[in-house]
């Protein structure tokens, strides 16, 4: 569900919404962080009908969200973060 | 007090079209994702299909996906369905259900008493 | 998607006894389940949301727990307004209900 990629590509998110998804229409979370081509962190969002969305980093629903899905994968619940480096 | 308030339901022929409505009041609507439930004569209950605060972002289970449109009218405090190419399958009681708010402890909380679809020659 | 395997499909029970009822997950639904009541010609009522939580007005004598992929609904001592039908939903993934338990009296 959270995916997490260092890339040097420049920014992806062109807007951001803070507009609350229901983690049960979320298929997966792709977090990228500041560096190299971007200045800020970006977050993006697959949902289920097929459509993406980049989310807000400070809005307050995804941060919660993320930490659950932290602690879930950090109790060793079927919830994997994925860590991947590309080049 | 909450109210949810289905109208629309009736006899269509397989193929013919049919459009839903919920009216809805003692809550603010456009604070809510919202859902259709449906329910076959003696059957248990099915998910149908769910909409987003401003009608922006819906879902809808596979076996509808092509001809149901959920859709809302916040002005209106109203929810609808609209259903095309319908099959037998498809006759149900048909509710409409509150589905989501930011926390979630609302999830399919209050629901309407329901309208009959059938769908016979 | 997920599956909900509901049991027993039905059950018969006399007023004062304690039921249970019992949902399986076919994945992890890490506790986003709710507990329905409804009876015949009604719309389901809520009794219990996220495993454990009971409904605003909801007697105590109904209860919820689980975990993981296994969940279950406690009635601790049956009264004559509880037989009816009781569905679990899953919210974990989309939406999927369980296919019902019909309670009976004995």
């Known amino acids: 569900v959270l995916e997490v990629y260092y890339t040097s590509l420049r920014c992806r998110c062109v807007q951001e919404s803070s507009v609350f998804i229901p983690r049960r229409f979320i298929d997966r979370i792709q977090i990228l962080p500041r560096g190299n081509g971007c200045p800020r962190k970006e977050i993006i969002v697959w949902k289920k009908n097929k459509s993406i969305v980049c989310v807000d980093p400070q809005a307050e629903w995804i941060q919660r969200m993320m930490e659950v899905l932290r602690k879930r994968s950090s109790s060793t619940l079927p919830v994997p973060v994925f860590k991947r480096k590309i080049p | 007090e909450v109210q949810l308030v289905e109208s629309g339901g009736g006899l269509v022929q397989p193929g013919g079209s049919l459009r839903l409505s919920c009216a809805v009041s003692?809550?603010?609507?456009?604070?809510?994702?919202m859902a259709w439930v449906r329910q076959a004569p003696g059957k248990g209950l099915e998910w149908v299909a769910s909409?987003?605060?401003?009608?922006?972002?819906?879902y809808y289970r596979d076996s509808v996906k092509g001809r149901f449109t959920i859709s809302r009218d916040n002005a209106k405090n109203s929810l609808y369905l609209q259903m095309n190419s319908l099959r037998a399958e498809d006759t149900a009681v048909y509710y409409c259900?509150?589905?989501?708010?930011?926390?979630?402890?609302?999830?399919?909380?209050?629901w309407g008493q329901g309208t009959l679809v059938t769908v016979s020659s | 998607d997920i599956q909900m395997t509901q049991s027993p499909s039905s059950l018969s029970a006399s007023v004062g006894d304690r039921v249970t009822i019992t949902c399986k997950a076919s994945?992890?639904?890490?506790?986003?389940l709710t507990w329905y009541q409804q009876k015949p010609g009604k719309a389901p009522k809520r009794l219990i949301y996220?495993?454990?939580i009971l409904q605003t007005g909801i007697p105590s004598r109904f209860s919820g727990s689980g975990s993981g992929t296994e969940y279950t609904l406690t009635i601790s001592s049956l009264q004559p307004e509880d037989f009816a039908t009781y569905f679990c939903?899953?919210?974990?993934?989309?939406?999927?209900f369980g296919q019902g338990t019909k309670l009976e009296i004995k």
């Open positions: 259900a509150t589905e989501e708010d930011y926390d979630g402890s609302y999830v399919m909380d209050a």
């Open positions: 003692g809550f603010t609507f456009s604070d809510y994702y």
């Open positions: 909409i987003n605060y401003d009608g922006g972002d819906t």
């Open positions: 994945q992890n639904i890490n506790k986003e």
């Open positions: 996220n495993t454990n």
């Open positions: 939903l899953q919210q974990s993934s989309l939406y999927t």
